[in-house]
Interface confidence: medium
């Protein structure tokens, strides 16, 4: 399969290279935020597959924002093959084995396996179907082969790799991390408030992904969707985590410039290649 040997540029009439991301936020589009500072920051561009500079306004934005080029590369790229996978002579685990389990933001509830660095074992978890990270395996065996130590304390040596011409890195061929934004949408936190079909007027909260806040709405008592919480705290706990909007310590004042709506920078329908 030559699909990883493509050039860096998209060529629309040939096979396109799969994309594997260590962290889901690496796919977010750079967001300068509504403030007006001029701060040089870096983001990972999924199309060029490189960390690039952008000007950050100083507040809000998203997690695809790094103080330095090195930090960005560390979080989002695999240009240093040894960082991700050591040579089989060294028998070391790839870095993503040490990532925490990440169910992502969607609601597929798919059974997957991840390597738990605390217990040093592969364990089952429920994957939502999108986002997440590379510590995500379709089978227990696959997880064990890649991340667990063999009986002699060495990593099992059947971790197939292939040179990826896109960023000159080695990418695991056996990890079938599902499409990053597979058509498993939408996440309930991204759906609009839905009163439902009944006639009650119950006070509820929903997560407004445009402004990144939990807002009250009147629930009819039946139907609707799962973007429906009995308290603001419950709403924030469930939804805010995925869309952190960090205010800078500088305490910048938002100007009266027309505020750019804080839409989620990725559509949860985004449909990617299966083997990301």
């Amino acid at each position: 399969d030559s699909e990883e040997d493509e050039e860096h540029t998209i060529i629309t009439d040939t096979e396109l290279p799969p994309l594997k991301l260590m962290h889901s936020f690496c796919a977010f589009k750079a967001d300068d935020g509504p403030c007006k500072a001029i701060m040089k920051r870096f983001f990972f561009n999924i199309f060029t597959r490189q960390c690039e500079e952008f000007i950050y306004g100083g507040c809000e934005g998203n997690q695809n924002r790094f103080e330095s080029l090195e930090e960005c590369k560390k979080m989002c790229t695999r240009d240093n093959a040894n960082r991700i996978i050591k040579t089989t002579l060294q028998q070391e685990k790839p870095d993503f084995c040490f990532l925490e389990e990440d169910p992502g933001i969607c609601r597929g509830y798919i059974t997957r396996y991840f390597y738990n660095n605390q217990t040093k074992q592969c364990e089952r978890f429920k994957y939502g179907g999108c986002l997440g990270n590379m510590n995500n395996f379709e089978t227990l065996e696959e997880c064990k082969n890649i991340c667990e130590d063999g009986p002699n304390g060495f990593q099992v040596d059947n971790y197939g790799t292939q040179l990826n011409a896109v960023n000159n890195s080695l990418t695991p061929q056996s990890t079938k991390v599902p499409s990053l934004f597979e058509f498993h949408g939408p996440s309930w936190c991204l759906t609009p408030a839905d009163r439902g079909l009944c006639r009650a007027n119950e006070n509820r909260f929903y997560y407004n992904s445009v402004i990144g806040k939990c807002r009250p709405f009147k629930y009819s008592g039946c139907g609707g969707n799962e973007n429906n919480f009995t308290s603001k705290q419950e709403c924030l706990r469930a939804c805010k985590k995925g869309f952190i909007q960090r205010i800078s310590k500088g305490g910048l004042i938002k100007t009266k410039r027309k505020r750019k709506k804080q839409r989620v920078k990725i559509a949860y329908e985004e449909i990617f290649v299966k083997n990301m």
């Epitope: 399969d1 699909e3 998209i10 629309t12 009439d13 040939t14 096979e15 396109l16 799969p18 994309l19 796919a27 589009k29 967001d31 561009n45 999924i46 199309f47 060029t48 499409s179 934004f181 597979e182 058509f183 498993h184 949408g185 939408p186 991204l190 609009p192 992904s209 445009v210 750019k260 709506k261 804080q262 839409r263 989620v264 920078k265 990725i266 559509a267 949860y268 329908e269 985004e270 449909i271 990617f272 290649v273 299966k274 083997n275």
Partner: antibody, heavy 118, light 108 residues
Framework: QVQLVESGGGLVQPGGSLRLSCAAS????????MTWVRQAPGKGLEWVSG????????YYADSVKGRFTISRDNSKNTLYLQMNSLRAEDTAVYYC???????????WGQGTLVTVSS | DIELTQPPSVSVAPGQTARISCSGD??????AYWYQQKPGQAPVLVIY???NRPSGIPERFSGSNSGNTATLTISGTQAEDEADYYC???????????FGGGTKLTVL
């Protein structure tokens, strides 16, 4: 080289049915989600339906919901669009397209014309 | 739902610069793509990810996207650039693809 070839279009009466096919080659079909886009004569492009790489999730534009069904057979490298209860306003060239990063439609077929008329 | 608005037509003299706009609420927070379509043919991708050119697309094609507007710029427009151009983005709803109404570029 990526190739998408649509077939199954033709003339059908209002209320009738048609099944469009899109034969894919030159890429690993089962790795990609796919979509149908249509274009009425002299009009713009309109997204119709989409399906995940393994067929487990399907999406439809409001205008076709309940009447059209998208499906795929990965063993045959083929995408389908079953169109029932056809209306005059469904008359269009139907394109299948492969979906790439961030909903980019990278790779289109040449289209098949569906005419709904009595 | 995000709606994308394009001017129905743009005219430009050969060798001049053509600019086709695509506006939508907070469009700059999404990636924008541009397709060129000539009569009787399927759309062809000319710009992806706001500003990137696929291989085979001439350097005179460029793109930008910020605020509420994405712009396709064709510098030194040539007769063969005469076509319909569509912007596309995605919806933070249930549509994986949202298209602008299309702009007919006429090279005078």
């Amino acid at each position: 080289q990526v190739q998408l070839v649509e077939s199954g279009g033709g003339l059908v009466q209002p209320g009738g049915s048609l099944r469009l096919s899109c034969a894919a080659s030159g890429f690993t079909f089962s790795n990609y989600s796919m979509t149908w886009v249509r274009q009425a004569p002299g009009k713009g492009l309109e997204w119709v339906s989409g399906i995940s790489y393994n067929g487990s999730n399907t999406y439809y534009a409001d205008s076709v919901k309940g009447r059209f069904t998208i499906s795929r057979d990965n063993s045959k490298n083929t995408l389908y669009l079953q169109m029932n209860s056809l209306r005059a306003e469904d008359t269009a060239v139907y394109y299948c397209a492969r979906i790439y990063y961030m909903n980019l439609l990278a790779g289109w077929g040449q289209g098949t014309l569906v005419t709904v008329s009595s | 739902d995000i709606e994308l608005t394009q001017p129905p037509s743009v005219s430009v003299a050969p060798g001049q610069t053509a600019r086709i706009s695509c506006s939508g609420d907070a469009l700059g927070t999404y990636y924008a793509y541009w397709y060129q379509q000539k009569p009787g043919q399927a759309p062809v991708l000319v710009i992806y990810g706001d500003m990137n050119r696929p291989s085979g697309i001439p350097e005179r094609f460029s793109g930008s996207n910020s605020g509420n507007t994405a712009t396709l710029t064709i510098s030194g427009t040539q007769a063969e650039d005469e076509a319909d151009y569509y912007c596309q983005s995605y919806d933070a709803g249930v549509k994986p693809a949202v298209f602008g109404g299309g702009t007919k570029l006429t090279v005078l």
